[in-house]
């Protein structure tokens, strides 16, 4: 017996081929007896069968002893075996119809689960495997589950169910909704201009929602909530803002925030959450400020940092083209009656400058001492 | 498992220059800087610069400033260290070192290139 | 430039007995801002390069035996191997990255009594 593998919701064509290449008579039925097709001369007649309606040939075929049964817009129970009754001979086809979907909705928040549903008809026992965009394999049974979704699965899913040698393929498009960064470091100056963007990893036709930043400065004890904001079809509207400091919203997608200078008191962490409309849990990104500030101070040249840096990073005070003069892995660095000349603060990863602030030192001019 | 690859032995007349090779493989590699240590025969080890591969920029110790230039290739994973004005002091094994993901220590070391100065 | 001082220079210990080495830094290399020790240990065999035991003064390194721990704060740090094995014959460095330029201790050469 043939066995073929059909897919839910898809068009499946059973073939059966006469030993003579022209028209003849022929009838398809299932496993009742009960006929779904045949013909008369040169026309299709139908059965009291469930398929009525979604049941075909191809009558351009006939001519050359082929009298093939397609089923459309498939079901689980169309699994049946289907006989073909042509110069008295029986051809079986089995037909086994499956189905896989996506638990709830395909488009999930970062961090949540996915769950694939196989629909199968009674007596098989298929296996499934699906790879997903990133290129992870997983396998399973009647359920298959991903926790803890992350960016890269976003895209389409392969999965292939196996039953009797035969193989069937889907293909589910999940989108993973998410902030294009988990995480970012803004460097700026103190009295810089600071701007955070919260670009979507995403898109779709209407976003509604909701969003909020927290803060959390290095300085402070507790974190305060910076500005609260409204999402409706992308535009974006300013529920609430603090008086110090006093951001600026973008009204459009990306969510950009401006903070009109950065300040030692403003450096630390934030964590922004959108949470959308139709969908349990919020979206998070956190966002980190880190802010320079070079002084001078009678005879003492400081450069110091604030916000959350890492303990990699270098902290350098260095008289324009020439070496640095100190050097540490510091917040604050700071040299003893610098020479004259334009003095770089300098904070490096490995070599690569972060942030840098220019202070000019005046040459010091002894006054002479009267007699 | 991320390796690093050099380059082979070289010899060298006085005056000359030395340009050694570091592949790495297995990793991201411009998401962490490379230093480049040397071993003169018997001795110590002797730190002689840094490059962070993700933008070239370079920190050279002062002994070897204006003799050595690090570069990068980022399409090969490949680091270079020049050597120029080679003396006989210069004899020596030469290290690329990859440093940490969460710290600056070596963790990852290239089996070393040795580079003979003699006239 | 900080100078890293290590001794002994060379060490006999027998098989199973404890080995210590000390390294002494020109300057502090505990970061007040971070509060770690910029200070890593390394092993080097004969026709090897370096490999790394110990980093922030007292972290092993994964795949590292525990017999090797690293102690000290400040100036002054020690490598300890608890329980000395054959394969530990070699050379120990000491190494500063609290600032450039880095630099190594002259080395200490652990031999079997």
């Known amino acids: 017996k043939k066995v073929v593998l059909g897919k839910k919701g898809d068009t499946v064509e059973l073939t059966c081929t006469a030993s003579q290449k022209k028209s003849i008579q022929f009838h398809w039925k299932n496993s009742n007896q009960i006929k779904i097709l045949g013909n008369q001369g040169s026309f299709l007649t139908k059965g009291p069968s469930k398929l009525n309606d979604r049941a075909d040939s191809r009558r351009s075929l006939w001519d050359q002893g082929n009298f093939p049964l397609i089923i459309k817009n498939l079901k689980i129970e169309d699994s049946d075996t289907y006989i073909c009754e042509v110069e008295d001979q029986k051809e079986e086809v089995q037909l086994l119809v499956f189905g896989l979907t996506a638990n709830s909705d395909t488009h999930l928040l970062q961090g949540q689960s996915l769950t694939l549903t196989l629909e199968s008809p009674p007596g098989s026992s298929p296996s499934v495997q699906c790879r997903s965009p990133r290129g992870k394999n997983i396998q399973g049974g009647k359920t298959l589950s991903v926790s803890q979704l992350e960016l890269q699965d976003s895209g389409t899913w392969t999965c292939t169910v196996l039953q009797n040698q035969k193989k069937v393929e889907f293909k589910i498009d999940i989108v993973v909704l998410a902030f294009q960064k988990a995480s970012s470091i803004v460097y700026k100056k103190e009295g810089e201009q600071v701007e955070f963007s919260f670009p979507l990893a995403f898109t779709v036709e209407k976003l509604t929602g909701s969003g909020e930043l927290w803060w959390q400065a290095e300085r402070a004890s507790s974190s305060k909530s910076w500005i609260t904001f409204d999402l409706k079809n992308k535009e974006v509207s300013v529920k609430r803002v603090t008086q110090d400091p006093k951001l600026q919203m973008g009204k459009k997608l990306p969510l950009h925030l401006t903070l009109p200078q950065a300040l030692p008191q403003y450096a630390g962490s934030g964590n922004l959450t959108l949470a959308l409309e139709a969908k349990t849990g919020k979206l998070h990104q956190e966002v980190n400020l880190v802010v320079m500030r070079a002084t001078q101070l009678q005879k003492n040249l400081t450069c110091e940092v604030w916000g959350p840096t890492s303990p990699k990073l270098m902290l350098s005070l260095k008289l324009e083209n020439k070496e640095a003069k100190v050097s540490k892995r510091e917040k604050a660095v700071w040299v003893l009656n610098p020479e004259a000349g334009m003095w770089q603060c300098l904070l490096s990863d490995s070599g690569q400058v972060l942030l840098e602030s220019n202070i000019k030192v005046l040459p010091t001019w002894s006054t002479p001492v009267q007699p | 498992q991320v390796q690093l690859v050099q380059s082979g032995a070289e010899v060298k007349k006085p005056g000359a220059s030395v340009k050694v090779s570091c592949k790495a493989s297995?990793?991201?590699?411009?998401?962490?800087?490379i230093s480049w240590v040397r071993q003169a025969p018997g001795q110590g080890l002797e730190w002689m610069g840094i490059i962070n591969p993700s933008g070239g920029s370079t920190n050279y110790a002062q002994k070897f400033q204006g003799r050595v230039t690090m570069t990068r290739d980022t399409s090969t994973s490949t680091v270079y260290m020049e050597l120029s004005s080679l003396r006989s002091e210069d004899t020596a094994v030469y290290y690329c070192?990859?440093?940490?993901?969460?710290?600056?220590?070596?963790?990852?070391w290239g089996q070393g290139t040795m580079v003979t100065v003699s006239s | 430039d900080i100078v890293m001082t290590q001794s002994p220079d060379s060490l006999a210990v027998s098989l199973g007995e404890r080995a210590t080495i000390n390294c002494k830094s020109s300057q502090s290399v505990l970061s007040s801002s971070y509060n770690k020790n910029y200070l890593a240990w390394y092993q080097q065999k004969p026709g090897q390069p370096p490999k790394l035991l110990i980093y922030?003064?007292?972290t092993r390194e994964s795949g590292v035996p525990d017999r090797f721990s690293g102690s000290g704060s400040g100036t002054d740090f020690t490598l300890t191997i608890s329980s000395l094995q054959a394969e530990d014959v070699a050379v120990y460095y000491c190494?500063?990255?609290?600032?450039?330029?880095?630099?190594f201790g002259q080395g200490t050469k652990v031999e079997i009594k």
């Open positions: 297995g990793g991201t590699f411009s998401s962490y800087a």
């Open positions: 070192a990859r440093e940490g993901r969460d710290h600056d220590a070596f963790d990852i």
């Open positions: 922030w003064a007292s």
């Open positions: 190494q500063q990255y609290y600032t450039t330029p880095f630099t």
